[in-house]
Interface confidence: medium
Amino acid sequence: LPAQVAFTPYAPEPGSTCRLREYYDQTAQMCCSKCSPGQHAKVFCTKTSDTVCDSCEDSTYTQLWNWVPECLSCGSRCSSDQVETQACTREQNRICTCRPGWYCALSKQEGCRLCAPLRKCRPGFGVARPGTETSDVVCKPCAPGTFSNTTSSTDICRPHQICNVVAIPGNASMDAVCTSTSPTRSMAPGAVHLPQPVSTRSQHTQPTPEPSTAPSTSFLLPMGPSPPAEGSTGD
């Protein structure tokens, strides 16, 4: 004979637990049904009647099987520096992530609480570590033989062009200027851009730092809003 299936509410055997999607109600001392995601317990169970569930109201949700008396409130609307990547429904909370050019300075369980603009490295400084979804750009001074003449959150230090005859020597913020004879260059001309952080959790390739005789200051700056530090600009 097959074992009898107990219907909720029922008293569990001593030492046993309730089944999946049931909970033990301390007051009734019975195993009772949980409410499905998108619902909440409107009336708790008793010894003779099971849990009565009701749908979550607008702007509230439950994501799990539960027996809560009220659904959880969805988070506030996404701010102007954020993108809504998941809408508030009866079964899930709203999720806000940072828009391109910003990173998450203060995260929460899902999504971002506070976005901050990616740091821009000023001329003479290049990107040592690109920004990601959750970390800011790190700037470093351009090593001898390299330069950056832009204010950018993506440009790395590039090698000076190699001249047959130098008209103006290059420095950290300016390329070398050659006389009219055509220059040779170890890298293709034009700005080198690093990828912007995107809202998916993709891996970014980091620029290979070129050998440097400059001090090894990594310019690791605190997350979150802060005054512009050396090598970076607030704009």
Partner: nanobody
Framework: EVQLVESGGGLVQPGGSLTLSCAAS????????IGWFREAPGKEREGVSC????????NYADSVKGRFTVSRDNAKNTVYLQMNSLKPEDTGVYHC?????????????????WGQGTQVTVSS
Amino acid sequence: EVQLVESGGGLVQPGGSLTLSCAASGRYLEYYAIGWFREAPGKEREGVSCISMSAGSTNYADSVKGRFTVSRDNAKNTVYLQMNSLKPEDTGVYHCASEPYGCEDGLLRGYDYWGQGTQVTVSS
């Protein structure tokens, strides 16, 4: 699934203090409340305190009000039970348990996941 591990139990003299820890791991922890229960030989399991991981709201059994304090560290996913002015009748195995979603409605009505428990003995 939520996993819970208690620690911090021990032998203490009446009037002494202990702090229990409940380390939680798993998804959706912010939806849960963590409650402390105790079991003593010959007694029914008793709800001691509860804290909502999201709101931080708390509840206590009358027998421990003013002596026990429950707190949480969301960064470490850990709940603490600070027990002061301990009495022999506080002796028992203390378990933490989790429940969706809060404990605004009194101590836990039910529980999903249990830790193994930590023994607290109050004796001179």
